[in-house]
Structure formats: structure tokens, C-alpha cells
Interface confidence: low
């Protein structure tokens, strides 16, 4: 091993603080003892170290807990986080959400990273489902989590979680997440009146089967066509011409132009014309 | 010399999204240990502070107004900017951008000029 | 959130007499390992923009009078003005910059 550089006289670290950052690298090396700087994490993120000079605290921390870090500094890791690789972040137990969202806040506002993903990866399977209270800081941080994974990994999210998902959170769904979620979500809000369900369920409809859709044809819910036209086309087909005149109400004059379009386009083949001309719309069947 | 200038509409309608920029020159906004601050002050009022972006990137928000508001960058123009969704009159107010000094000041040690900007149908 | 809560909020004195203003906030500002006190003082005159005075609690602004003097640590901070020049006439802030960043109501120091 290559001997390591002797810390300089007097420039010892007693305490993690501002005059860090006019040391140069090898210094910060030979200088901050491994120990104090995991006890002192918190005030690391008050300091502006240069990149390089992370670097080596990093390293630092590395000899320090080759195994993985512990929670307490973890949580404290600040802007230290970003230069984590996710193999660093599999070896760590995070079970805090405190420390999640503190981890989050410093990814704030960029994409989710290959460290991020990992970093949540290893808290969820922590905690074993994906609870509301962690549903709901990961989609406030990350509104398009939810669509991220998989069906099933999606079959872990309690009913109970489905209550902090907002309809943004399911843009980018695909049918069979919505085919997961769905349930899910009718389950969570079994217990509300018409119209306060329905304004709860709307989002997750594009997992709705055929007989749910009719369901809500006789509750006068007057579903809008961007709705509509994620519903998926099997559910749609069975549905006749009354009930999916019920179930749009003001909004069925918006078949007109969607005619060309899935779903809209396949279920107008389904019906016979007589009743497509009930709606005076000109549809052709 | 270092110098900051915002711009944006003088006048927007309620509901609209706002757009500012702020045009730094004679500094670079990557430089280490520094901040990029906006805050605002409506009409005989006092400042608020908004939020910040910092030189690698780093981005916070204030508590009470975050949900609203997305700060970012431009490095290769040298440009941060601040975009708030569905404003209200409430939002009528100067707006500021400024530099903070993080290693020598923790303080905001320049400031552009403001822009003004009335929330009206 | 830290909230910084200024006293007076406006007070009229004539020119060459000593004015001291009081600002507070609802959390200590003090580092235990800086020993510095994370708060600012700003002056803002009519139609202008702010300018800093002093930060670190009691550390001048280069090029600002040494008549400003700031003073205090921990929770109670005060920014003096030794003899007020007519020219001092404006909204006086101060600012914390301990977690995250918030600003005092303001004091309008008026002259008489």
C-alpha cells in the first residue's frame, strides 16, 4: 500500500467547518479523521466543497464503513449524495422516511438518477409494500414513480396508499398498470357517495372492465371525452349506444370528432345505425 | 463587474404561467460556492424570498410557495430563470434576482434592478 | 421555517441622532461549529434594490459607512446607525440565512 502523506503541523481538523475549504485534497485526506467527519456529516452540506474535495471525503467515508454506511449518516449526506454510485447506495438499510426525503431534496428539480432508483428500490423492499405515507413523498417528489413500475410491484401498493396518488401521478400509465391499480383504487373508495367517487375514481379508469363502465352509465356522472378515450377498448365495445349516451351526458357530442379514433372508432362499428342516429350526431357504423 | 438584470412580461393574466430571467454578466453562475436567488416584493410590501439554484445545480424552494414555482438553469447563456404556474393578483410584485456568496458572505452581495410585474385581466 | 420578526416597524428621527433597530427570529442562527451568526442586514431606498450591509451578523459590507454597525447572536440581532444622514432614509431588512433563506418585515426609517 502507498504510504500515506503526513498531515501538515497544525492544520489537524478539529471540527468539520468552513476553513476545509481552503485545503487542498491531500490534506483533506491526511487531515480529517474518517470518525469526526461521520459524526460532523450534518454541517458538510453547509460547506461549499468543490467536487473534488467530496471526492475525497467520500473516500473517506468509504474506508471508514466499507460494509455500507449507517442511517445516521445517511441522512445527512447532503449534496455527498449525488456522488454515491448506486453499488454504494445497495449496500446501505434505509429504513426512515425522514432520510429518504432528505436524500430526495438534494435530487430535487433533475430527473430521477440511477441512484435514486436504487436509493427507493432499497427502501421500499425495506419496508416491505409501498405505504401511503412513502406513495406519497415519492410521487411529490416524482410524480411519474408510480407509472415507473412494474404490474408487479404494483400489486404491493395497499388500497390504503391509493388515497395520495393525484391524477397527474398516473400520465404516463400504461393499461396494464391501470389494469393493477384499478381495483385498488375502487377498493380504497368504496365508501364515498356518486359524485365524490367518480371525481376519485376518474383517473384510474383506464383499468375499468365492462361492467364498472355500465355501472357508472346509471349515475349520471357525465364522463369527459379526454376520459373516455383512455378507457380501454374491450371494456368499451359491450357498452350500448344508451349507456354510453349516459355515461358522456353533455359531453357525447365530443364522438363526433373522435370518430376516426380508438376506442371511439371501434365501438361505432359495433353498433347498428339505427341507434347510432338516436344520438344525432351523423356517426356511421 | 458583475451584473444582474431580470426580464419578463410587465403584465400577465390571472390563471397564465410566468415566465423570468435573470441575464448574469461578468460572473460566472457555475463559479464554486455560489448561489442564485429570486425573491419578490409586491407592491409596499416587504421581500419574500422564493427560492435558489446553486452552482452545481442544486435547487430549493421556499416552504410556503414551492408547489407553484420551478426554478432552472441555462449555463451556456449564463441565464437562471423562475416560472410560477396559475398566477393570481396576488403574484403582482417586483421580482429580483441576486447573487449570494456562500464561502466569504452568506449574504446577497448583488442585485439586478427588478422587474415589475401586475397581475390583471 | 424560521421566522424573523423586526421591530419597529417605522420610526422617525432627525439627522444626526443615533437609531437602533431590533430583529428577531424564532430559532437560534448561531453555528456552534462556525461561531458565525447566519444573518444579514439590507438597506433598501426608495425605487432601489436592496443592498447588503452587514452579514455574519456584525461584519460590514465593503464600501458601506462605518456609521452601520451590527450587533447581537443567537436570537436577538440589532442593526445601530451612529448619527443618521438624510441619505439613510429607507426600508431596512434583515435576513436569515441558517436553513433555507427568510427576511424580516422591515423597518422604514424616516427623517424628521
Known amino acids: 500500500e502507498v504510504e500515506k502523506t503526513a498531515c501538515p503541523s497544525g492544520k489537524k481538523a478539529r471540527e468539520i467547518d468552513e476553513s476545509l475549504i481552503f485545503y487542498k485534497k491531500w490534506e483533506l485526506e491526511a487531515c480529517v479523521d474518517a470518525a469526526l467527519l461521520a459524526t460532523q456529516m450534518d454541517r458538510v452540506n453547509a460547506i461549499p466543497f468543490t467536487y473534488e474535495q467530496l471526492d475525497v471525503l467520500k473516500h473517506k467515508l468509504d474506508e471508514l464503513y466499507p460494509q455500507g454506511y449507517p442511517e445516521s449518516v445517511i441522512q445527512h449526506l447532503g449534496y455527498l449524495f449525488l456522488k454515491m454510485s448506486p453499488e454504494d447506495i445497495r449496500k446501505w438499510n434505509v429504513t426512515s422516511l425522514e432520510t429518504l426525503k432528505a436524500l430526495l431534496e438534494v435530487n430535487k428539480g433533475h430527473e430521477m438518477s440511477p441512484q435514486v432508483a436504487t436509493l427507493i428500490d432499497r427502501f421500499v423492499k425495506g419496508r416491505g409494500q409501498l405505504d401511503k405515507d412513502t406513495l406519497d413523498t415519492l410521487t411529490a417528489f416524482y410524480p411519474g414513480y408510480l407509472c415507473s413500475l412494474s404490474p408487479e410491484e404494483l400489486s404491493s401498493v395497499p388500497p390504503s396508499s391509493i388515497w395520495a396518488v393525484r391524477p397527474q401521478d398516473l400520465d404516463t400509465c400504461d393499461p396494464r398498470q391501470l389494469d393493477v391499480l384499478y381495483p385498488k383504487a375502487r377498493l380504497a373508495f368504496q365508501n364515498m357517495n356518486g359524485s365524490e367517487y367518480f371525481v376519485k375514481i376518474q383517473s384510474f379508469l383506464g383499468g375499468a372492465p365492462t361492467e364498472d363502465l355500465k355501472a357508472l352509465s346509471q349515475q349520471n356522472v357525465s364522463m369527459d371525452l379526454a376520459t373516455f378515450m383512455k378507457l380501454r377498448t374491450d371494456a368499451v365495445l359491450p357498452l350500448t349506444v344508451a349507456e354510453v349516451q349516459k355515461l358522456l351526458g353533455p359531453h357525447v357530442e365530443g364522438l363526433k370528432a373522435e370518430e376516426r379514433h380508438r376506442p371511439v372508432r371501434d365501438w361505432i362499428l359495433r353498433q347498428r345505425q339505427d341507434d347510432l342516429d338516436t344520438l344525432g350526431l351523423g356517426l356511421q357504423g | 463587474e458583475v451584473q444582474l438584470e431580470e426580464s419578463g412580461p410587465a403584465v400577465i393574466k390571472p390563471s397564465q404561467s410566468l415566465s423570468l430571467t435573470c441575464i448574469v454578466s461578468?460572473?460566472?453562475?457555475?463559479?464554486?460556492?455560489?448561489?442564485w436567488h429570486w425573491i419578490r416584493q409586491p407592491p409596499g410590501k416587504g421581500l419574500e424570498w422564493m427560492g435558489r439554484?446553486?452552482?452545481?445545480?442544486?435547487?430549493y424552494y421556499s416552504p410556503s410557495i414551492k408547489s407553484r414555482f420551478t426554478i432552472s438553469r441555462d449555463t451556456s447563456l449564463n441565464k437562471f430563470f423562475i416560472q410560477l404556474s396559475s398566477v393570481t393578483n396576488e403574484d403582482t410584485a417586483m421580482y429580483y434576482c441576486?447573487?449570494?456568496?456562500?464561502?466569504?458572505?452568506?449574504?446577497?452581495?448583488?442585485w439586478g434592478q427588478g422587474t415589475s410585474v401586475t397581475v390583471s385581466s | 421555517d424560521i421566522v424573523m420578526t423586526q421591530s419597529p416597524s417605522s420610526l422617525a428621527v432627525s439627522a444626526g441622532e443615533k437609531v437602533t433597530m431590533s430583529c428577531k427570529s424564532s430559532q437560534s442562527l448561531l453555528s456552534s461549529r462556525t461561531r458565525k451568526n447566519y444573518l444579514a442586514w439590507y438597506q433598501q431606498k426608495p425605487g432601489q434594490s436592496p443592498k447588503l450591509l452587514i452579514y455574519w451578523a456584525s461584519t460590514r459590507e465593503s464600501g458601506v459607512p462605518d456609521r452601520f454597525t451590527g450587533s447581537g447572536s443567537g436570537t436577538d440581532f440589532t442593526l445601530t446607525i451612529s448619527s443618521v444622514q438624510a441619505e439613510d432614509l429607507a426600508v431596512y431588512y434583515c435576513?436569515?440565512?441558517?436553513?433555507?433563506?427568510?427576511f424580516g418585515g422591515g423597518t422604514k426609517l424616516e427623517i424628521k
Open positions: 435576513k436569515q440565512s441558517y436553513n433555507l433563506r427568510t
Open positions: 461578468g460572473f460566472s453562475i457555475t463559479s464554486s460556492s455560489y448561489c
Open positions: 439554484i446553486c452552482y452545481e445545480g442544486s435547487i
Open positions: 441576486s447573487r449570494e456568496n456562500r464561502l466569504l458572505k452568506d449574504a446577497m452581495d448583488y
